[in-house]
């Protein structure tokens, strides 16, 4: 039946109202038209709407959908971008730390290597930096370019301190020697297997949240389509066009509508979980050697080892590279290099009291788990967005796109619009490039995710424990093992706590006496720690 | 549309353990958390935890670990909260609320289930 | 834990007004905060989530706001439905915690 006459048969109330989302009055109607040009609002008898304010109000009603996509993942966005944020700071200054506990080792055990070692330690330690924040650079060159390098200083300065000055062109020969004659045993290895695991995840977690951005940013910026465009249009808007100003969309009707414009998005609902629980498999991994903040914060350890065993065989060493080095051509060795702010003052040595005790395993677990109430984040958006447009409630007395009803029939409605556009026809066109896009990579980082994550009781690879690991006593969950300095296996307990109770934020990047106490920003981030009982390096 | 309908009020004695539960119905259960809330008489809300029901992944305020013990069942979409040791400190009204999947905010609540601690 | 103040435990104003609950996180929470009403009946109702964004439902009379660690709710022509106890609640840092509540009553 014909739709009851506008209750204004001046157009009135449609002018007043759409003058607020158009100032001025040039494009209402008077009293009501024929409204022949209409396209979207097509009228079963006079209307107040012209082509002009059909075009205004699909700008609108795009405009509304791209607002309330925007609202719906406020949240969720702010939790990625926080998080993604909190742990590359928190990476870094991990990183930051591992350096100063090795640089402390040095100055501490080795002082006579200190000037050379601060250097070559730097620049092994900004090459991790750079690592996990996506460079191109392979971590067992990095390994073998700080072995390589320290080994020179320590043959000259700890194994053969008397060498004349005349001698000191060997460098070249000794970097050669280091690899040939496995100076540092198995050490160096162990770090790179260590190292490059650690990193290797640690860098895929980063890359993850970053993408976890970029998808929920794709889906934030989403541009409807013009068909789209047209059924909001006929849904939140052309009942004015009839007068019916405080008439509501039915319920059923909406949902309809949105499946249609929100077909593509839907479309990454599947991506987006499979995202989250491969996050969380990796996230299950990452302790032990897959754990950088457990494997960096104890290379130093490892590192002044390796040097021991250096010492433990300098005699033989010795003897050798005496006989391979000794025809290497004179050449003049660089003039070392010495830091402005090489010296540790004892004063930088500061007990941190922190209140919370937490690690960055425990902060990757919190943000999972706050990750899990976003899983059917897209699947939910079409409701939600229905939820947050006006409604009528129980589909009575609502507006199906074409007329006023009584009830909400969907087949009505689809038979009601077969001859404006074809419903079905707008979800099988497949979703937007850009969401093809977002969902290719999603795609691709689930791979990649899958292929880190490990079993989660898997112990340590087997060439690990070949390579002088322990793998006993490594089962529980609340001891965590890791590769030890001196009396063999470090028992961690609760992971890595990394600088509370006596956290010694030794910072030989400051300048002398300054010590930078990194504080918590906001308790968003308080990657500081008690070393537990792991051996630290200042003594 | 999302509901949650809780198991009846309880009389139960000192030392004794009770367990309530939370039906759910009108959204995939196994994909939201279930949290549990506490209410004293005349007070105000305590977070006991939380339940992902996909994977029973569990996360408790340390106040109630030891107290709470939070379960659920996909197959009927019902969370449980067992309470041991009981005594008159235990005696509230106890929500459970669903999580997500907009916000982590608690988006729906059940009616509350009273659990008095009498000898 | 992040302690959660409402300083108000009970406010009361005439219908028509505009009433502001407020709530004081003894931390930054980075606006994961929500408000909640709980009727006299016990029922319990979401009404604001992430500080601002009005849960599925909520009369546009409701809204939130936050300057650096307060917050507040804002009820503007209060009506006789909104008898009730209001609570804020900050999930930004585990255990979650909630305010104490503030009741507001009709004069």
């Known amino acids: 039946q014909p739709p009851p006459p506008p209750p204004d048969a001046t157009c009135h109330q449609v002018r007043s109202f759409f003058q607020r989302l158009q100032p001025g009055l040039k494009w209402v109607p008077e009293t009501p038209v024929p409204g022949s040009d209409l396209q979207v609002c097509l009228p079963k008898g006079p209307t107040c709407c012209s082509r002009k304010m059909e075009e205004k109000y699909q700008l609108t009603a795009r405009l509304n959908m791209e607002q309330l996509l925007q609202s719906a993942s406020m949240e969720l966005k702010f939790l990625i971008i926080q998080n993604a944020a909190v742990f590359q700071e928190a990476f870094e200054i991990v990183v930051r730390h591992a350096k100063n506990y090795t640089n402390a080792m040095f100055k501490n055990n080795y002082p006579s290597l200190t000037p050379q070692a601060f250097e070559f330690v730097g620049e092994f330690f900004t090459d991790v930096s750079l690592y996990i924040l996506g460079s191109d650079i392979n971590v067992d060159d990095m390994v073998n370019e700080l072995f390589d390098s320290l080994f020179p200083v320590i043959y000259t300065q700890l194994m053969n301190p008397g060498l004349p000055d005349s001698a000191l062109d060997i460098n070249e020969c000794l970097r050669g020697a280091r690899r040939d004659l496995k100076v540092f045993g198995n050490f160096p290895k162990l770090i790179m297997t260590q190292v490059s695991k650690s990193l290797q995840v640690t860098r895929i977690f980063l890359q993850a949240l970053n993408l976890g951005i970029e998808v929920i940013n794709t889906t934030d910026h989403l541009k409807f389509s013009k068909d789209c465009g047209r059924m909001l249009t006929r849904m939140w808007y052309c009942s004015y066009c009839q007068g019916l100003m405080m008439v509501k969309p039915c319920g059923g009707y909406c949902n309809v509508v949105m499946q249609g414009c929100m077909a593509g998005v839907v479309e990454i609902d599947k991506y987006w979980r499979e995202y989250i629980l491969s996050l969380e498999e990796l996230v299950n991994g990452m302790y032990r050697i897959y754990d950088m903040e457990n494997v960096l914060l104890g290379l130093f350890s490892t590192i002044h080892d390796s040097i021991q065993y250096v010492q433990k065989n300098a005699g033989k060493l010795t003897t050798t590279i005496g006989k391979l080095c000794a025809h290497s051509q004179q050449r003049q060795y660089r003039s070392a290099y010495y830091p402005e702010d090489l010296f540790i003052d004892k004063k930088v040595l500061k007990v941190a009291h922190v209140e919370h005790e937490e690690t960055l395993s425990s902060r990757r677990r919190e943000l999972i788990q706050k990750l899990k109430s976003f899983i059917s984040f897209y699947s939910a958006l079409p409701g939600y967005i229905c939820s947050h447009s006006p409604v009528a409630e129980n589909d009575t007395l609502c507006w199906n796109g074409q007329e006023l009803v009584e009830r909400y029939s969907q087949k009505a409605a689809r038979n009601g619009m077969k001859n404006q556009f074809n419903l079905h026809e707008l979800k099988m066109k497949g979703p937007e490039p850009v969401v093809s896009q977002i969902i290719d990579k999603l795609k691709h980082i689930n791979q990649l995710l899958r292929t880190m994550s490990m079993p989660k009781g898997r112990v340590l690879d087997k060439n690990l424990d070949e390579e002088g690991f322990e793998s006993g006593d490594c089962g529980d969950d609340e001891d965590e093992c890791i590769g030890g300095s001196g009396d063999g296996m470090i028992k961690v307990k609760n992971q890595l706590r990394f600088l509370a109770e006596l956290a010694y934020d030794l910072d030989v990047d400051d300048a002398p006496g300054n010590s930078q106490q990194a504080t918590p920003k906001d308790n968003e981030i308080s990657t500081f720690h008690n070393l537990g009982n792991v051996h630290s390096p200042l003594k | 549309q999302v509901q949650l309908q809780q198991s009846g009020p309880e009389l139960v004695k000192p030392g004794a353990s009770v367990k309530i539960s939370c039906k759910a119905s009108g959204y995939a259960f196994s994909n939201s958390w279930m949290n549990w809330v506490k209410q004293r008489p005349g007070k105000g809300l305590e977070w006991i935890g939380w339940i992902y029901p996909g994977d029973g992944d569990t996360n408790y305020n340390g106040k109630f670990k030891g107290k709470a013990t939070l379960a659920a069942d996909k197959s009927s979409s019902t969370a449980y909260m067992q309470l041991s040791s009981l005594t008159s400190e235990d005696s509230a009204v106890y929500f459970c609320?669903?999580?997500?999947?907009?916000?982590?905010?608690?988006?729906?609540w059940g009616q509350g289930t009273l659990v008095t601690v009498s000898a | 834990d992040i302690q959660m103040t409402q300083t108000t435990s009970s406010l009361s104003a005439s219908l028509g007004d505009r009433v502001t609950i407020s709530c004081s996180a003894s931390?930054?929470?980075?606006?994961?905060l929500s408000w909640y009403q709980q009727k006299p009946d016990g029922t319990v109702k979401l009404l604001i989530y992430y500080t601002s964004n009005l849960h599925s439902g909520v009369p546009s009379r409701f809204s939130g706001s936050e300057s650096g660690t307060d917050y507040s709710l804002t009820i503007t022509n209060l009506e006789p439905e909104d008898i009730a106890t209001y609570y804020c609640?900050?999930?930004?840092?585990?255990?979650?915690?909630f305010g104490g509540g503030t009741k507001l009553e009709i004069k």
């Open positions: 609640q900050q999930y930004s840092k585990f255990p979650w915690t």
């Open positions: 609320a669903r999580s997500g999947p907009i916000t982590m905010g608690f988006t729906y």
């Open positions: 931390q930054g929470i980075s606006n994961y």
